[in-house]
């Protein structure tokens, strides 16, 4: 669980000719508000689907009245952040739509009137817990500047907010099978919280909120004993529909035991037999002490002298891992800005900068956007080389002169038609096919080849599986 936060910095006329008329006037004062809609994934169809990750509406901004004869300035904005809480994992890749709405406060009969001034959309990658990301988007002659981030709500941590952390119960170490919770080293990973009501005897979970059944049990909460009389296979995940055991992976498949541990199946789950020096449910906890010299590459070992006291290796620059055994690819952190080439020289990092940039990390832009033109509502962005344009939706190329055709790759299957709608590509399927990409045949009896229709949808409804 966590919160996506959006901070609007400015909304006003973009650079270049054709400045928009102010949306407010002395006769018709108005104020702005914003709506954000989030959808998971980077797929084009995200724009057609509901705001599956969530949506939020800002407060109303201050009332604004245009000064006669003055050009439209940046318009006064609402206070505060737009916050979109998400209950499940943060997907890492997401699509957004930000709408700017105008509330007219003139002598409207029946209260204020609202109209949509601008809509921008985009697809981004974002790790939870990271810094604020800045963005500029154009919508016609308007320009929206904003920042966004995703942060986890305690006790969740990690780039997807899926790991749970709790304060340590003992000062020196975490419980069996539980690791320290980086970056909060004074906390420990918490046991997973399974779906509410999941049987503690017959169910388990590997992700929060799920309930997976042990052998011999079925049902959404693993409370229904399986009848094995009509079943062929002696083991496997239970089928809730038949009450039967169907073939499937055993608990030891893929060997869940770490560090060379051997796995054996038990009536309820599995058991790891760990090699000397390791213990825990999956042999992931080391019983080694600092006396055994476990830290490689000059790492400094800190910890107690007895096997029950965990040790920690403090690694020198350039190394990582619980035993400092991994060399850090420091270039993987992409320290060189603006497309600079990263060179890891061992003792130091070097950035080889592209034309137009300088500085130890290529952070200094030697070239501003003066006199540079980006076509079709594109914005010239400082820091992208000699001249980089951030293009409006639907345009691409160095100067945004090329129309980006999302249909060029022919994404609609079986003769379906692809349309370049402003919100993303849209497929209209040929008769006999359905799905967001026309990938599913519709059987003559009206049923589709889909495994199952989502709740509330008939299988015969086309293009709704988004």
């Amino acid at each position: 669980a966590g919160v996506f936060e959006l901070q609007i910095h400015s909304f006003g006329p973009g650079p270049g000719p054709g400045a928009p008329r102010s949306p407010c006037s002395a006769r018709l004062p108005c104020r702005l508000f914003f709506r954000v809609c989030l959808k998971p994934g980077l797929s084009e169809e995200a724009a057609e689907s509901p705001c599956a990750l969530g949506a939020a509406l800002s407060a109303r901004g201050p009332v604004y009245t245009e000064q006669p004869g003055a050009p439209a300035p940046d318009l006064p904005l609402p206070d505060g952040l737009l916050q979109v809480p998400f209950r499940d994992a943060w997907p890492g890749t997401f699509s957004f739509i930000i709408e700017t709405w105008r509330e007219e406060l003139g002598d409207q009969i029946g209260g204020p009137a609202w109209s949509l001034l601008a809509r921008v959309a985009g697809r981004r990658r974002l790790a939870a817990g990271g810094p604020w990301a800045r963005d500029i988007q154009r919508a016609g002659a308007w320009e929206l500047r904003f920042s966004y981030r995703a942060r986890c709500e305690p006790p969740a941590v990690g780039t997807a907010c899926t790991r749970l952390c709790r304060p340590r119960s003992a000062p020196s170490r975490c419980g069996p099978g539980l690791r320290p919770c980086a970056p909060l080293e004074d906390e420990c990973e918490a046991p997973l919280v399974c779906r509410a009501g999941c049987s503690p005897e017959h169910g388990f979970c590997e992700q929060p909120g799920e309930c997976r059944c042990l052998e011999g049990w079925t049902g959404p909460l693993c409370t229904v004993p399986v009848s094995t009389s009509s079943c062929l296979s002696p083991r496997g995940p239970s089928s809730a529909t038949t009450g039967c055991l169907v073939p499937g992976p055993g608990p030891c498949d893929g060997n869940p035991c770490a560090n060379g541990g051997s796995c054996s199946e038990t009536p309820r789950s599995f058991e790891c037999t760990c090699p000397r020096g390791f213990y825990g449910l999956r042999c992931e906890v080391s019983g080694v002490t600092c006396a055994d010299g476990p830290c490689f590459n000059g790492g400094l070992c800190v910890g107690g002298a007895d096997p029950d006291s965990a040790y920690i290796c403090h690694c020198p620059p350039g190394f990582q891992g619980s035993n400092c055994e991994k060399r850090v690819d420091r270039c993987s952190l992409q320290p060189c800005r603006n497309g600079g080439l990263c060179l890891d020289l061992g003792h130091a990092l070097r950035c080889r900068c592209r034309a137009g940039f300088a500085g130890p990390r290529c952070e200094h832009d030697l070239d501003d956007c003066a006199g540079r033109a980006c076509a079709n509502g594109g914005t010239c962005v400082e820091g992208g080389g000699a001249h980089r344009c951030s293009c409006a939706l639907g345009f691409g190329g160095r100067d945004c002169r090329e129309r980006a055709d999302p249909c060029a790759a022919r994404p609609c299957a079986h003769g379906g038609r692809c349309y370049a709608h402003f919100s993303g590509l849209v497929c209209a399927c040929a008769p006999g096919y359905m799905g967001a990409r026309c990938e599913f045949p519709v059987h003559p009896d009206g049923a589709s080849a889909l495994p199952a229709a989502p709740p509330g949808l008939r299988p015969g409804d086309p293009q709704r599986y988004l």
Epitope: D405, R417, A420, S423, P462
Partner: antibody, heavy 118, light 109 residues
Framework: QEQLVESGGGLVQPEGSLTLTCTAS?????????MCWVRQAPGKGPEWIAC???????TDYASWAKGRFTVSKASSTTVTLQMTSLAVADTATYFC???????????WGPGTLVTVSS | QVLTQTPSPVSAAVGGTVTISCQST????????LSWYQQKPGQPPKVLIY???NLEIGVPSRFKGSGSGTQFTLTISGAQCDDAATYYC??????????FGGGTEVVVK
Amino acid sequence: QEQLVESGGGLVQPEGSLTLTCTASGFSFSSSYDMCWVRQAPGKGPEWIACIYTGDGSTDYASWAKGRFTVSKASSTTVTLQMTSLAVADTATYFCARNSGYGYFGLWGPGTLVTVSS
Amino acid sequence: QVLTQTPSPVSAAVGGTVTISCQSTESVYGSDWLSWYQQKPGQPPKVLIYQASNLEIGVPSRFKGSGSGTQFTLTISGAQCDDAATYYCQGYYSGYIYAFGGGTEVVVK
């Protein structure tokens, strides 16, 4: 600014022929759209005639328009509608319109008037 | 595919609510590929709503579309004098077929 402009309308005799042209500006047919013709008789509602899908050049017609009307792409910015065996009932304003998704016409031309009269 | 609009004409006072219905003889594509247009004399139709309920950019929020399958409604809440016009529904059907409704004239008094 994306725009459509129709041309080629005018007075034509019954049983005569006429070709209308739709010219796009601000965009081209290199992207995938349905470029369509819709007509509206005086005092009546709009009536769909035909479309050409710019993605692959395939065409679709209203059942009543098949045979007498032909839609084609003349260039990357022009679409034409050829009309034959015109009758007085074909008198209408003919609009060029674009569907760029979800089956609606988000961009229209101002229309060109075709009068069929002897 | 025939779209039938009711009623016509319809009259409303300024600030009042106007409701126009549109019924199709068969389900539109995707159950929601239906749009609404406003037309004033001498002008082409202007789209208000697409995909049954999506407001086109620049259209005041007093216009609202709803419905799915074969039955759709356009509602104008707090009608203004400028809303006096003829309104048309238009559907898109499987097989790449388009159809328009017969229109509903709205008078605002």
